[in-house]
Structures are given as C-alpha cells and as structure tokens.
C-alpha cells in the first residue's frame, strides 16, 4: 500500500481467483484513543472499533472511503483504491490502446517546436467518476523539472455504438534548451482513477521524436505566363522555432483532386516556393517536416487550384 | 576550415556535407519507432557518447559570439562516431548488409571532421569507451542505439552549419 495523495491510498493486488489479497491497517488521524468506530462509504454498519482497523482487501467491495467517527463526529477519512496486477501485468482498463505508432500506446505526445512545450493526449470510453493527474520530468534518476497543467476533456467522438472521450494536457520543460541535443528523455506519468480503480500510464520520449510542425501558412498562388504551371509560395508556421536559418524545415508540395486515387503532381523542396501544374477541381497542398531529423510531417495546408 | 587562431570554417561545404550525413544516418537506420531502444535497458552503453549540450555554444547566439567552442564539440563528436562506426561493433558479426549506408556514413564523418580540422592542428578528442558486446544480438542492439544517437547529433550539427552558412559566411 502507498499514499497517492493526502488520505488516498493505493492497494496493489495480485488479481486471480481466490487470491488472498492484502492485509491493510488503517489508523485514525486523531489524538483520541477510545470510542472510535469505523464505517465504509455511505453504510452505517460498524466495521470495527479502536484507533486502528485491520482489513483484508481482496476485491473492489473492500475498497472505498473508510471513515473513523467518535460520538457521531467524523474524525478522518482514508480512501482506498485498488491497482490490479494480472499475470504480472498492471491493468490498463481505463485508457484505450491507440495502437499508434505501436501496440500498447496509451499516451500520445506531440510538440510543435523545440521550445520544450508539448501536448499529450489519451482516449477513454468512460464518461463519469474519472480523474487524471499528470507529472513529468526530464530524466528519471536525477529528474529536471517539467511543469504540466491539469488534464482537460478536449474532444468527444462517436465510434460505432460507443462514445470516446479524449483528454489532453500541456506541459512545459522548465529550463528548455532548444538548440541542444537531448541526451535524457522526457518522462510523462499519468495517474488515472475511475471510481475505486487506480491505474498509471507512462511515456518516455525525446522532444525531437515527437516534433510535428504546424502546417505552413499563407499559401499563395501565382499563375505563370504561357504555361500550365503555377508558382505556389508559403511561409513557416508561426509556432515553429526561430531563427529559421537554424531550425529549418523541408516541404512537400502536392497537387491532387478530391480523391486520393486521382493523379497528382508532387515535388519536395527546402525553399518556401515551388512551381507545380494546377488542374481544374484540384487543390495545392503543402506540408512541412524538420529538415534534419525525420520526425512527423505536419498536416496539409491547402488552397484550391482555381 | 576551423584552423588554429579561430578563423571560420568553410560553412557552405560543411553545410552540404552535414546535410548529407543526416540523409545517410536515416538511410542506415530508417526504422525509427519500430524498436523502442529505451525499453531495452543498459543505457550506459550510449550514455558515453558526446552530446551537444546547452553550454556548448551551438545555439544561434553562441555561434555569433564565438563559433569555435561549438565547432570543437562537433569535431569531437564526429571523431567519436567515426571511430565507433569503424569498430568491431559495426565490423563484427552479424555482418552488415552489403548495401548498408554505414560505409558511406563512416567516410562522410571522416570527411566533415577533416574539413573542420586540417592536418597539423589537434583539438582534444574524447576517449572512446570500450564497448565490446559479446553476443551478436547485443551488437545489433548497440548499432541501433549508436545510429539513433548519431541521427540526433548530426541533426544539431547540420543546423549549426546551415545557420553558419546563412549568417556567418564571409
């Protein structure tokens, strides 16, 4: 058993049929010595008396808010949560496996630049009695500070018969060094509590591996005289690291109709302009990627050909 | 060339060669993400590689103030990786595929380090740790880790030379 926060404890249980469970001793936070009784949750049934209560925790029915009283007055609470371990593996029932970029990916994180700011998000089908708390650091043995905000519900989607909820959190490295080569990864830890179930999820990454620039901005077209060609120009996204002579992007320019199966014109460039062939009912799209490190491409920025 | 007395390197040549190094480093190990090397433990094996750190003057301001600190750090790293790529980690079993770009990568690391330091002038170089994994699978894992680390190193070096070519070239 360990303390998650004040008056909230997590009991780690091996979860299998007829498991013996864990013996837990609760102590009432009071100077009083006698006349103390214990109850669980809203029940008035007295579970025991005395300053300490010893219980065998085997299942979720044994978890909950234990309260010690004296003469009708509440003295203190202890909330017991369960963390299940099945076949040596901690349960991951609360969050959905996003399966990208690989199986068992529960947390996904992205950064728009090298400033040390990043966003992580996760998915669940649970809508109520759910809380998250996020901690982060650079490195684990001698951790350097990363400050994370509160996790918030950022999107709701319908997937077949189910509703899916997306939560996200923003974090900022306290002393970021955008130009340096990272040697220690960022660690992100998410504590998830649903009713009386506790789970924790972690992710470890270098900012360079989660970079995904915003799409290029201000796409403009200039038709070339006596030609089917069009000069398309754009600018670096505002959120990208500066100076651009140091933090350079490379771009992919594509002309394509509405369907992915349609024919296309495609060219890669390090410049912020390119000449392509525009077709009626087609769009010109441009996306960006770090020029020197193959992290994710941005989403496309598009303008119609006409 | 970054010669004694602190004159400027051939920024544009260094830019071209460092960008080539980036391409080669990714050709040598494109499967980033397919193998999470941090899950594989034994971090000490690649902890000894020289990293371009915050105080090394490789940021735009540091380069403007005095690029020599940064160039020396990059040179150290190039020599370090060049030696690693020539060591039995890469030459031993399992043999590299005949079309592996590691050979080109090795030659290009040497080429860029020579651009930075002409014969007769010696910057201090970092000692290469004795990394001699006994098992072929350990060697394979170590190659992956070294190449991952090299990708990050050459990305910073390429940014330095691109910025230098754009803003510090005479």
């Amino acid at each position: 058993i360990w303390e998650l926060k004040k008056d909230v404890y997590v009991v780690e249980l091996d979860w299998y049929p007829d498991a013996p469970g864990e013996m837990v001793v609760l102590t009432c936070d009071t100077p009083e010595e006698d006349g103390i009784t214990w109850t669980l949750d809203q029940s008035s049934e007295v579970l025991g008396s005395g300053k300490t209560l010893t219980i065998q925790v085997k299942e979720f029915g044994d978890a909950g808010q234990y309260t010690c009283h004296k003469g009708g007055e509440v003295l203190s609470h202890s909330l017991l949560l369960l963390h299940k371990k099945e076949d040596g593996i901690w349960s991951t029932d609360i969050l959905k496996d996003q399966k990208e970029p690989k199986n068992k990916t529960f947390l996904r994180c992205e950064a728009k630049n090298y400033s040390g700011r990043f966003t992580c998000w996760w998915l669940t089908t649970i809508s109520t009695d759910l809380t998250f708390s996020v901690k982060s650091s650079r490195g684990s043995s001698d951790p350097q500070g990363v400050t994370c905000g509160a996790a918030t519900l950022s999107a709701e989607r319908v997937r077949g018969d189910n509703k899916e909820y997306e939560y996200s959190v923003e974090c900022q490295e306290d002393s970021a060094c955008p130009a340096a080569e990272e040697s220690l990864p960022i660690e992100v830890m998410v504590d998830a509590v649903h009713k009386l179930k506790y789970e924790n999820y972690t992710s470890s990454f270098f900012i360079r591996d989660i970079i995904k620039p915003d799409p290029p901005k201000n796409l403009q077209l200039k038709p070339l005289k006596n030609s089917r060609q069009v000069e398309v120009s754009w600018e670096y996204p505002d959120t990208w690291s500066t100076p651009h002579s140091y933090f350079s992007l490379t771009f992919c320019v594509q002309v394509q109709g509405k369907s992915k199966r349609e024919k296309k014109d495609r060219v890669f460039t390090d410049k912020t302009s390119a000449t392509v062939i525009c077709r009626k009912n087609a769009s010109i799209s441009v996306r960006a990627q770090d020029r020197y490190y193959s992290s994710s491409w941005s989403e496309w920025a598009s303008v119609p050909c006409s | 060339r970054a010669v004694p007395g602190g004159s400027s390197p051939a920024w544009t040549q260094c830019q071209q060669l460092s960008q080539k190094l980036c391409t080669l480093a990714w050709s040598a190990h494109p499967l980033v993400g397919h193998m999470d090397l941090r899950e594989e433990g034994d971090e000490e094996t690649t902890n000894d590689v020289p990293h371009i750190q915050c105080g090394d003057g490789c940021d735009p301001q540091g380069l403007r103030d005095n690029s020599q600190f940064c160039l020396q750090r990059i040179h150290q790293g190039l020599i370090f990786y060049e030696k690693l790529l020539g060591s039995d980690i890469f030459t031993g079993e399992p043999s590299l595929l005949p079309d592996s770009p590691v050979g080109q990568l090795h030659a290009s690391l040497l080429g860029l380090s020579q651009l930075l330091q002409p014969e007769g002038h010696h910057w201090e170089t970092q000692q290469i740790p004795s990394l001699s994994p006994s098992q072929p699978w350990q060697r394979l894992l170590l190659r992956f880790k070294i190449l991952r680390s090299l990708q990050a190193f050459v990305a910073v070096a390429a940014r330095v030379f691109a910025h230098g070519a754009a803003t510090l070239s005479p």
């Epitope: 024919k263 060219v267 | 050709s27």
Partner: antibody, heavy 118, light 107 residues
C-alpha cells in the same frame, strides 16, 4: 495490368512529320498522365512533354515547343505524338509512358523507332 | 534546364559484388530524383522514386540514397540480369531531365 502498346516503326524524309500512337489498356485512360520520351541510337533519354488525357492540357520541353503536338482520343484510350519538320537528329526510339504521378515514369510502351533519312 | 551528371560512365563489376552509381545535380533538387534501368532493346524500368523509395516488384538489392545535389544507387550483390544501363532523372523542375547513364558491365 497497365499496358501501353505503340505503333510500328517509321521511316521519314527530312522536313516531313511523324505521328506515333500509344494505346493504353488495363486502367481508366484519364486517370494517368502520359509522357513522351525519346532516345537517339546509343544515346541517353530525353523528355519531350506530357499530356493530361482528362482535359488535354500539355506541356513540352522548350527544345520541342512549336514542333511537337501531343493529343489523346479518350474514346479509344489512345495518345498521339506528332513531331514536325523532322531532321536527321530526330532519328530515335520514341517511348510513351504513363503514371499517376506527373514527374516520373512508371509504365513504358515498347518504343517506336523513327528513322529520318533522305 | 537542370543538367544531371552520372558517374562513372561505365562500371565493371563481377557478379555478386556491390555496385555504387552516382548522380549529381548542379543545384539542390531535394529528393526529386528517380532511377531507371534499361537493358538492350528494351524500354527503361523504374527502380527507385524520390531518391530512396522502393517500388514493389523491384528486388531489394536495389536501394537509393541522397538528397540535395548528391545521389547514389546501390546494387548490393549484382546478379547476371542487373548488367544494364542505369539512368537518374530529376523532377525538381521542368523540363524533366535525365543523366547521361552509367553502363554496368561484367568484369
């Protein structure tokens, strides 16, 4: 599968014109760009131009502008390349090729030998 | 127009050996570079597109690398059917242009 079949060899006199055909099969004709590339005997490859069968748009290399006409007949899935004012250095194998991407050449015809000789 | 330069013009290699073919551009063309193989009396065949992207049906012994101005086609272990002429082609700008070719012959 995608296939391009070209017309047979031609012998032309200097100053004449030649029209080479290229019949496409195995795909929707308007879904691919069509290019023409030529190769003089013992020489390298030279791009001449492209046509979009969907709308008839064309673009040719500056060297051939005013001398080459590329057309298509969507009813027969056939592309044509006409080269006028032939000279002896136009002697070459002329290839048509098709691709969904505009700037490189995926599927090639078997080639048509055009000999320009007086 | 962009003039592409291939080297060497002829490469003599023994079967089973590795062949490295080079293609240079006079200015940066990013990764807008494609490789073709042509055997005598046949039309060319696309091997690699956008510098390093492999084509289904093309043996894995063919690989491409490079970006900017320098590109390489590597044939890891030459088979008898690989002796042919290889061309690079830039698609950075129109007109599309080819290199002069590298003939890979039996040593």
């Amino acid at each position: 599968q995608v296939q391009l079949v070209q017309s047979g060899a031609e012998v032309k006199k200097p100053g004449a014109s030649v029209k080479v055909s290229c019949k496409a099969s195995g795909y929707t004709f308007t879904d691919y760009y069509l290019h023409w590339v030529r190769q003089a005997p013992g020489q390298g490859l030279e791009w001449m131009g492209w046509i979009d069968p969907e709308n008839g748009d064309t673009e040719s290399a500056p060297k051939f502008q005013g001398r080459v006409t590329m057309t298509t007949d969507t009813s027969t899935s056939t592309a044509y390349m006409e080269l006028r004012s032939l000279r002896s250095d136009d002697t070459a194998v002329y290839y048509c090729n098709a691709n969904k991407e505009l700037r490189y050449f995926d599927v090639w015809g078997q080639g048509t030998m055009v000999t320009v000789s007086s | 127009e962009i003039v592409m330069t291939q080297s060497p013009a002829t490469l003599s290699v023994s079967p089973g050996e590795r062949a490295t073919l080079s293609c240079r551009a006079p200015q940066s063309i990013s990764i807008n570079l494609h490789w073709y193989q042509q055997k005598p009396g046949q039309a060319p065949r696309l091997l690699i597109y956008f510098a390093s992207q492999s084509i289904s049906g093309i043996p894995a012994r063919f690989s491409g690398s490079g970006s900017g101005t320098e590109f390489t086609l590597t044939i890891s272990s030459l088979q008898s059917e690989d002796f042919a002429v290889y061309y690079c082609q830039q698609s950075n700008s129109f007109p599309l242009t080819f290199g002069g070719g590298t003939k890979v012959e039996i040593k």
